[in-house]
């Protein structure tokens, strides 16, 4: 390590008046003052890597990446980025510190990522490595699409006041249920704004930016289709568009549909129908009932009725704020060490939540499912067995949601042992929480039979990452016992383990693991 | 040059509420991300880590101090503050803030710069 | 929380002489393991990170080992300026740890 060179790696960030073009520079601009970011070397590597601490910057800052070098004689570089070589020019300071700069002007997605800088100097070669990425700023947003008739034309188009300006695109599928999961070959996508085929089975519309993506159904009511046990159930904020369409299939054109909120036909200019015949000659009729902008007086069951068909209804709830409903209490699972066992959590929300599971402070991909009766359900199943604190975070622009679990694994206990000068303790994490016993081993008791009660202190404690409880014993020791070997013994419903300890010995000193079943 | 420099009282009284601030000077917690930790030292005996800020405001505290302590950070100001309820005369120690680097890689050096500390004594 | 257990809690010892310490975790902690440097009324000082790899610009003469429960840090030959306290420091789980210390006193 003696001939590696002492590195600084700081940022600038630079007012955003400049007019400095290039990417790679030796002279940076006038700018705030540089801020070390605790550049050091790489553990467990292969080569000497430097990382500097990860750089967050917002959308359209003007940064330069600097690294000082302390070493003798010259250094020669490359910047790479994306693999791409980027050009670069070392020079030197007063201090006759090597100086690498890298400018970024207008930081923009593309220019995020991983810069790696490396230098060769006349002892050593080494690698700095940089990761930039913008900050989330309110800049950039993703909203949920929405539905507006297309002047004088039957057709739909799809709206979603995102930034940056977001593709958007229908997706359309024609089968029934499960087949109209998104990767499935009945699905289309077609990247445009404006829709014309507006009789099929199921369509969505969706956003999507560096944000991520948003989508919006077509809420459906098909006068063909067995009515669902529970009234299906529309929630939109005041202020929102409401759209449902009805659709009814017959075998010719005689018939008619109709859309009544609360037994009193909907106001022209609230409605518009489309018919069209299908391939078997068959006639499909769709009845769209759309408000620009709900309010308060928009609720109640819109009930669309033909006279070929029996009526269905949906109950449009309007709110004034979005909601997450479901049970926030605790909930604590034990299970077997090869159990399957998921977490599941059920609630209704709008708009549309977003969602994590969280352990030891790592997040994994939340993915919800629609059940029938207008509630959703998330759940998680990648614990990996791993007791401790689960939780689940829910989110939409309205309402957030916490729910804690608690996992406990079936275990037997292993024992861990240590003694002090004082002390001799014992830890275990077996679950259920072990009990303890101390034994003697002498020449009367070989076989450390003769238990200890004197001087036994036991607890449980919290291991604050995981959640988890561990069980510790601790012997104090006394004039009797010291010199002696001591056994410490964990047992639950699923076991014991013990630990053999000599009680003169000043470090930890676990002289041998005894596993007994 | 990178300095963390703590300011507090030096004397507190005991129930007191004792609040320290940690300024920091050569990094900032907008652009770089960096965590702070609390540590303290009472006279002649060992280091006791107290609570740690991360850079998304994540925080973590002592098991035996976690009903007292409160860390918070003010990104504009470039600040860190500590406080700890209920003082008493075992909490007199000398209270240090040091910085740890968050790499995107994930491994961690724990803290590389220090203050020089701040001396608090609590008595009545 | 998890135990730091550091040997011995104090030496003596002359210029030259080759010093080591020693840490104990009650679990396994991987490499999350520091070594800092103290001297009376200054601050701690970060000699060895990630268990084994010296802190930039600190003498070579210090080196660290060790991953999971046992760790050990070396001053293949100790100077005057070596004088001081040492501690470990696992951060690993929270609450994060230090050990109690060692002294390394003038023989």
């Known amino acids: 390590n003696q001939d590696l060179p002492v590195i600084k790696c700081v940022l600038i960030n630079h007012k955003n008046n400049d007019s400095s073009v290039g990417k790679s520079s030796s002279y940076p601009m006038v700018s705030e003052s540089p801020e070390d970011l605790g550049c050091a070397l790489r553990p467990q590597s292969s080569g000497t890597v430097y990382e500097a601490a990860a750089v967050e910057v917002d959308v359209s800052a003007s940064i330069t990446l600097q690294v000082l070098v302390d070493a003798p004689g010259n250094i020669s570089c490359l910047w790479v980025f994306k693999h791409s070589s980027l050009n670069c020019q070392p020079h030197f300071d007063l201090q006759n510190r090597g100086v690498v700069s890298m400018v970024i002007l207008k930081m923009t997605e593309t220019q995020a990522g991983e810069y790696l800088l490396f230098i060769q100097s006349e002892a050593t070669n080494y690698t700095i490595l940089f990761t930039v990425s913008i900050r989330n700023t309110l800049l950039y947003t993703l909203r949920r699409p929405y539905f507006r008739k297309m002047e004088n034309q039957d057709a739909l188009v799809c709206i979603s006041e995102s930034v940056p300006e977001p593709i958007v695109e229908w997706v359309l599928c024609d089968s029934q249920g499960e087949s109209c999961k998104e990767e499935s070959p009945a699905v289309v996508k077609k990247e445009e704004k404006v829709l014309h085929e507006l009789f099929g089975t199921d369509i969505r519309c969706c956003a999507r930016n560096e944000l991520g993506r948003e989508c919006t159904r077509l809420f459906t009511i098909d006068l063909n289709q067995t009515p669902q046990t529970t009234l299906p159930q529309l929630f939109l904020k005041v202020g929102e568009p409401l759209w449902i369409r009805c659709k009814a299939v017959h075998v010719n054109h005689g018939f008619g549909l109709t859309w009544e909120l609360e037994n009193k036909a909907l106001e022209e200019g609230n409605y518009f129908e489309m018919s069209t015949y299908s391939t078997n000659r068959t006639m499909i009729r769709i009845l769209f009932a759309f408000v620009s902008s709900v309010a308060r007086n928009d609720t109640g069951y819109y009930t669309c009725s033909s006279s070929k068909h029996p009526s269905q209804s949906a109950l449009v709830t309007i709110v004034e704020k979005g909601f997450i409903n479901a049970t926030n209490s605790s909930e604590d699972y034990e299970i077997d060490q090869y159990e399957e066992f998921c977490f599941s959590v059920r609630f209704k929300a709008y708009p549309q939540i977003r969602c994590t599971w969280t352990f030891s402070r790592k997040s994994f991909p939340c993915e919800q499912k629609g059940l029938d009766n207008g509630y959703s359900i998330s759940k998680f199943c990648n614990h990996k067995h791993q007791p401790g604190e689960y939780i689940f975070h829910a989110e939409n622009d309205d309402a957030q949601f916490t729910k804690m679990f608690t996992l406990n694994i079936r275990r037997k206990p292993q024992v861990l042992a240590e003694a002090s000068a004082s002390q001799a303790s014992c830890f275990s994490d077996g679950y259920p929480l072990p009990s303890w016993t101390w034994k003697k081993c002498s020449d009367k008791s070989p076989n450390c039979t003769e238990e200890i009660t004197e001087g036994v202190w036991n607890r449980k404690a919290n291991r604050k990452v995981f959640g988890q409880w561990v069980s510790s014993s601790t012997l104090n020791m006394s004039e009797a016992i010291k010199g002696f070997l001591v056994k410490c013994c964990a047992y639950n419903s699923l076991g014991t383990s013990c630990e053999t300890i000599l009680l003169n010995s000043p470090g930890p000193f676990p002289f041998i693991q005894d596993n007994i079943s | 040059q990178v300095t963390l420099k703590e300011s507090g009282p030096a004397l507190v009284k005991p129930t007191e509420t004792l609040t320290l601030t940690c300024t920091v000077s050569?990094?900032?917690?907008?652009?770089?991300?960096?965590?702070v930790s609390w540590i303290r030292q009472p006279p002649g005996k060992a280091l006791e880590w107290l609570a740690h800020?991360?850079?998304?405001?994540?925080?973590s505290y002592s098991t035996s101090l976690k009903s007292r302590l409160t860390i918070s950070k003010d990104t504009s100001k470039s600040q860190v503050v500590l406080t700890l309820t209920n003082m008493d005369p075992v909490d007199t120690a000398t209270y240090f803030c040091?910085?740890?680097?968050?790499?995107?890689?994930?491994?961690?050096?724990?803290?590389?710069?220090w203050g020089q500390g701040t001396m608090v004594t609590v008595s009545s | 929380d998890i135990q730091m257990t550091q040997s011995p809690s104090s030496l003596s010892a002359s210029v030259g002489d080759r010093v080591t310490i020693t840490c104990r975790a009650s679990q396994d902690i991987g490499y999350d393991l520091g070594w800092y440097q103290q001297k009376p009324g200054k601050a701690p000082k970060r000699l060895i990170y990630?268990?084994?790899t010296l802190q930039s610009g600190v003498p070579s003469r210090f080196s660290g080992s060790g991953s999971g429960t046992e760790f050990t840090l070396i001053i293949s030959s100790l100077q005057p300026e070596d004088f001081a306290t040492y501690y470990c420091l696992q951060h690993n789980s929270f609450p994060w740890t230090f050990g109690q210390g060692t002294k390394v006193e003038i023989k």
């Open positions: 050569g990094f900032s917690f907008r652009n770089a991300r960096m965590g």
């Open positions: 990630a268990a084994s």
């Open positions: 040091a910085r740890m680097p968050e790499y995107s890689s994930g491994w961690s050096g724990a803290f590389d710069i």
């Open positions: 800020i991360f850079s998304n405001d994540e925080k």
